[in-house]
């Protein structure tokens, strides 16, 4: 990880944020689709 001078902490935090963002987008898309289909 960048020649080992960094901890993996920040990368882990950012990966978790990316997963949250992705899930929010997917769930939001599904919700919009459900509303549209009603």
């Amino acid at each position: 990880h960048s020649d080992g001078i960094f901890t993996d902490s920040y990368s882990r935090y950012r990966k978790q944020m990316a997963v949250k963002k992705y899930l929010a987008a997917v769930l939001g898309k599904r919700y919009k689709q459900r509303v549209k289909n009603k």
């Epitope: 960048s2 001078i5 920040y10 990368s11 935090y13 950012r14």
Partner: antibody, heavy 108, light 113 residues
Framework: AEGGLVKPGGSLKLSCKAS?????????ICWVRQAPGKGLEWIGC????????DYANWVNGRFTLSRDIDQSTGCLQLNSLTDADTAMYYC??????WGQGTLVTVSS | AQVLTQTPSSVSAAVGGTVTINCQSS????????LSWFQQKPGQPPKFLIY???KLASGVPSRFSGSGSGTQFTLTISDVQCDDAATYYC?????????????FGGGTEVVVK
Amino acid sequence: AEGGLVKPGGSLKLSCKASGFTISRDYWICWVRQAPGKGLEWIGCISAGGGSTDYANWVNGRFTLSRDIDQSTGCLQLNSLTDADTAMYYCAGNLEIWGQGTLVTVSS
Amino acid sequence: AQVLTQTPSSVSAAVGGTVTINCQSSPSIYSGAFLSWFQQKPGQPPKFLIYEASKLASGVPSRFSGSGSGTQFTLTISDVQCDDAATYYCLGFYDCSSVDCHAFGGGTEVVVK
């Protein structure tokens, strides 16, 4: 990075180059500023890999982050500058390794 | 917006003594533990000391220790040395989807007598 004196309403581009190591794709280049005699203030971060960005709400579109992974460089574009933007601007890899900072003075 | 409140704003300690700096967050820090501490001396950039509330960064003396979770965090400097005279900042990591990803505490100046 080149700082310097800028007039109110002016623009400036700061750059930050990694030295002694290469930037990997999961690395983030963050920017923090510090007004004279004041505390640290987070500006934003950009992912070296995908170029994804996050900004502090107060930035309000005035500042823009960019990066060139091949050149191991991050940039901060400062626009519509005011006296309140006078500060030392730091880049920080993963908010762990910090650059020496560059002083930006906004004055007429 | 989130707020990181650091107390005290200034503290004086004798060489060999102990200093405790508090950092209170509202809302809670992401995952309860993503909080870092930095040391800054005049004319220098901040130096990374502690991450994830209690893990010591490489090369940092064991006299420095961090603790806490959720909203309350503490940096303790034991056996204080003259070289520890500096301003210390906490940095919070938050859920970027609801607030700014990061915020710094206001800083605590440590004066060594």
